[in-house]
């Protein structure tokens, strides 16, 4: 279904791995802060599956939720756990796998647009002639059936960074993911300052390239917290 495809195509905010620097390839992508959209789903991060310490569901991958690994365990020690499939018990939406949501303690299919904040996607079939507007007819479809660019090149639809050519990563572009260039030295990157924000950035950037990390630009140290500019810099 479109709903589940869109869920699987999403990327979410991800803090740097423990002991790692933001902008490390393990951090998946970087995103412009403060762009929020309504929604109750959870989002994908990086493509490895080792246990990841977390404080909330939004820090986990699309097929995971954040909880204590043992029943009745120490709430202070939480990791990303595998999502629950249809008809499994749940306590909240995030526990259910993409395409499902938690209803009356059971994961059920969310094919019928159950989320109030769900965004309609209009797939347009042609570019109209009037000011090049996207003015085709709209229909519901899956993303997997349509690739608008050669696989792996910049602008290609992707699911993970391994789908993209060298020098590109798979980053969010609205409710899809496309291959975008990995950031070079001096390019603007994003440090996630607003931990706990449940919004999702719509326009994401890739991580900083090899040997680079996302750090505050020296001449911006005096700037206010909200306007500090981060760039990819040599370690």
């Amino acid at each position: 279904t479109l709903n589940s495809v869109l869920n699987s195509n999403a990327i979410k905010n991800l803090p740097p791995p423990l002991g790692g620097a933001a902008g490390h390839p393990g951090s998946a992508v970087s995103a412009a802060p403060g762009i929020l959209y309504p929604g109750g789903n959870k989002y994908q991060t990086i493509d490895n599956y080792q246990p990841y310490p977390c404080a909330e569901d939004e820090e986990c991958g699309t097929d995971e939720y954040c909880a204590s690994p043992t029943r009745g365990g120490d709430a202070g020690v939480q990791i990303c756990l595998a999502c629950r499939k249809r008809r499994k018990r749940c306590m909240r939406h995030a526990m259910c796998c993409p395409g499902n949501y938690c209803k009356n303690g059971i994961c059920v299919s969310s094919d019928q647009n159950h989320f109030r904040g769900e965004i309609e996607e209009t797939i347009t079939e042609s570019f109209g002639n009037d000011h090049s507007t996207l003015d085709g007819y709209s229909r519901r479809t899956t993303l997997s059936s349509k690739m608008y660019h050669t696989k792996g090149q910049e602008g290609s639809v992707c699911l993970r960074s391994s789908d993209c050519a060298s020098g590109l990563c798979c980053a969010r572009h609205f409710w899809s993911k496309i291959c975008k260039p990995v950031l070079k030295e001096g390019q603007v990157c994003t440090k996630h300052r607003r931990k706990g924000s449940h919004g999702l950035e719509i326009f994401q950037r890739c991580y900083c390239g090899e040997g680079l990390s996302c750090r505050i630009q020296k001449d911006h140290h005096q700037a206010s917290n909200s306007s500090r500019l981060h760039t990819c810099q040599r370690h």
Partner: nanobody, 117 residues
Framework: EVQLVKSGGGLVQAGGSLRLSCAAS????????MGWFRQAPGKEREFVAG????????YYADSVKGRFTISGDNAKNTVYLQMNSLKPEDTAVYYC??????????WGQGTQVTVSS
């Protein structure tokens, strides 16, 4: 330096219409797409509508679906938001932003839209 120049905000009666436009100038690289966002007093900035040049798609928030229409001209680096059947709850500062291939996401200055009942 890229600048996003907006126009079209203002005060309108409930049920009325406004058209916002946002033009990017100074760009020497391509854009993947552009979007409109809004922020009402005391609330988070939220997505309103978006247009993807790369994918040939438009996107709308549920709250504006059927009332707002986004369109644009990639060649002219311009995006428009036609807002019809405006409601008091549409009152906010509206921003446009672009998803750029040079990795920087450019934001325009906000434009105030006030819908009176």
């Amino acid at each position: 330096e890229v600048q996003l120049v907006k126009s079209g905000g203002g005060l309108v009666q409930a049920g009325g219409s406004l058209r916002l436009s946002c033009a990017a100038s100074g760009r020497t690289f391509s854009s993947y797409g552009m979007g409109w966002f809004r922020q009402a007093p005391g609330k988070e900035r939220e997505f309103v509508a978006g247009i993807s040049w790369t994918l040939g798609r438009t996107y709308y928030a549920d709250s504006v679906k059927g009332r707002f229409t986004i369109s644009g001209d990639n060649a002219k680096n311009t995006v428009y938001l036609q807002m019809n059947s405006l409601k008091p709850e549409d009152t906010a500062v509206y921003y446009c932003a672009s998803d750029e291939s040079d990795a920087y996401n450019y934001w325009g200055q906000g434009t105030q839209v006030t819908v009176s009942s």
